[in-house]
């Protein structure tokens, strides 16, 4: 048994980092293999990840971690029973996927505008709070052309949009993704996203 | 909001040994380290140990082996840290103080008054 | 007896800019990173900046950390004269056995 492709993390930096590998043939990740990690500080205790298959040779774990902060760093062993097949070690700052936003909502109620919200998945004592900025996706149901980004560079999770810039009388979707440039993070995943019926008066035409 | 409350001021004679507590609210409690730090008066800041408190390891610095015991009563959020061998220098204000390699909080300190 | 060495007090009239220096070595500061607490009179210390530059949520902007080489700076603009206090830095090392330094303190007095 060898694996073929090293593990590669990444960290919410918060309370979890996922680590993907590939072995050299099918394997029952979970009765077959265990991650041990352990933080490199004073005191730190050894932790074990039992593994999920992820397709027929690919393994995925799911570490669990605490205060997780930009000094940390992590010795990972891989193990096959008493067979250390991989050793290596990983920085979660250094490899940050974001959570991914949550309570997407589309404010239809206020005059001709299109007010969206969503929540920050991160709590305020955590650094990554006040570093997000955000992608909102919208496009329509009915025409896959018409899709557009929106960039969010500023720190209230919220969008403001004029609804004619839609078009009147279809039903479109929008879903919200985030990341951060302190640390130079990959975008998180696509937030559930959220559908409106879009219509507004279209002004009078003298 | 994050709370670390300290038991209150003590006095004691020389030789004698001082327990002070420090509750924590408001976190996970055995998810972050807990440091206790003395500042003896019109002085500075020395720290003087950790304990992690998920399994009640401890490491002391270096100068108050053997005379202080740093534990933990998950079941109540509590550390405590106890000083034997009191002496007139260790008068200080002792402070318990939430994280690992900086302190994100601190309790509002115990004032240990040594006296003869 | 601390390990990073501070001056022992700077001052500045409100408004203006001030800096405090902490000076550590290879096994401290020059292999960690370094914070900074404040301590008003007669109370606990806060934390002010960690990681050498980041600032925790509350804390506004006109604190700012910096780290080179063995040292590290604080450095405040706008003075106020809510920012009279003690200032410590810290730092972890790791030479011999893990320990948790602390600056020798600045007092910072506003005109």
């Known amino acids: 048994m060898k694996v073929l492709q090293e593990p590669t993390c990444v960290s919410d930096y918060m309370s979890i980092s996922t680590c993907e590998w590939k072995m050299n043939g099918p394997t029952n990740c979970s009765t077959e293999l265990r991650l041990l990690y352990q933080l490199v500080f004073l005191l730190s205790e050894a932790h074990t990840c039992i593994p999920e298959n992820n397709g027929g040779a690919g393994c995925v774990c799911h570490l669990l971690m605490d205060d997780v902060v930009s000094a940390d760093n992590y010795t990972l062993d891989l193990w096959a029973g008493q067979q250390l097949l991989w050793k290596g070690s990983f920085k979660p700052s250094e490899h940050v996927k974001p959570r991914a936003p949550g309570n997407l909502t589309v404010h239809t109620n206020v005059s001709d505008t299109l007010l969206l919200t969503w929540s920050n998945p991160y709590p305020p004592d955590n650094y990554l709070y006040n570093h997000l900025t955000y992608a909102v996706n919208i496009w329509s149901e009915n025409d896959p052309a018409d899709f557009r980004i929106y960039n969010v560079t500023y720190l209230e999770p919220s969008l403001r949009i004029a609804a004619s810039t839609l078009k009147s009388g279809i039903s479109y979707r929008a879903r919200v993704r985030a990341w951060a440039q302190c640390y130079n993070t990959t975008w998180s995943e696509w937030s559930p996203s959220t559908k409106w019926h879009n219509s507004y008066r279209e002004p009078f035409e003298q | 909001q994050v709370q670390l409350v300290q038991s209150g001021a003590e006095v004691k004679k020389p030789g004698a040994s001082v327990k002070v507590s420090c509750k924590a609210s408001?976190?996970?409690?055995?998810?972050?380290?807990m440091h206790w730090v003395r500042q003896a008066p019109g002085q500075g800041l020395e720290w003087m140990g950790i304990?992690?408190?998920?399994?009640?390891?401890?490491s002391y610095a270096q100068k108050f082996q053997g005379r202080v015991t740093m534990t933990r009563d998950t079941s109540t959020s509590t550390v405590y840290m106890e000083l034997s061998s009191l002496r007139s220098e260790d008068t200080a204000v002792y402070y318990c103080?939430?994280?690992?390699?900086?302190?994100?909080?601190w309790g509002k300190g115990t004032l240990v008054t040594v006296s003869s | 007896q601390s390990v990073l060495t501070q001056p022992p007090s700077v001052s500045a009239a409100p408004g203006q800019k001030v800096t405090i220096s902490c000076s550590g070595g290879?096994?401290?500061?020059?292999?960690?990173?370094v914070s900074w607490y404040q301590q008003l009179p007669g109370t606990a210390p806060k934390l002010l900046i960690y990681?050498?530059?980041k600032r925790p949520s509350g804390i506004p902007d006109r604190f700012s950390g910096s780290k080179s080489g063995t040292s590290a700076t604080l450095g405040i603009t706008g003075l106020q004269t809510g920012d009279e206090a003690d200032y410590f830095c810290?730092?972890?090392?790791?030479?011999?056995?893990?320990?948790?330094?602390f600056g020798t303190g600045t007092k910072l007095t506003v005109l």
């Open positions: 103080a939430r994280g690992k390699y900086w302190m994100y909080d």
């Open positions: 408001g976190y996970a409690f055995t998810s972050y380290y």
């Open positions: 304990i992690n408190p998920r399994g009640g390891s401890t």
């Open positions: 290879s096994s401290n500061i020059g292999n960690s990173y």
């Open positions: 990681d050498n530059n």
């Open positions: 810290g730092t972890w090392d790791t030479s011999t056995v893990w320990e948790w330094p």
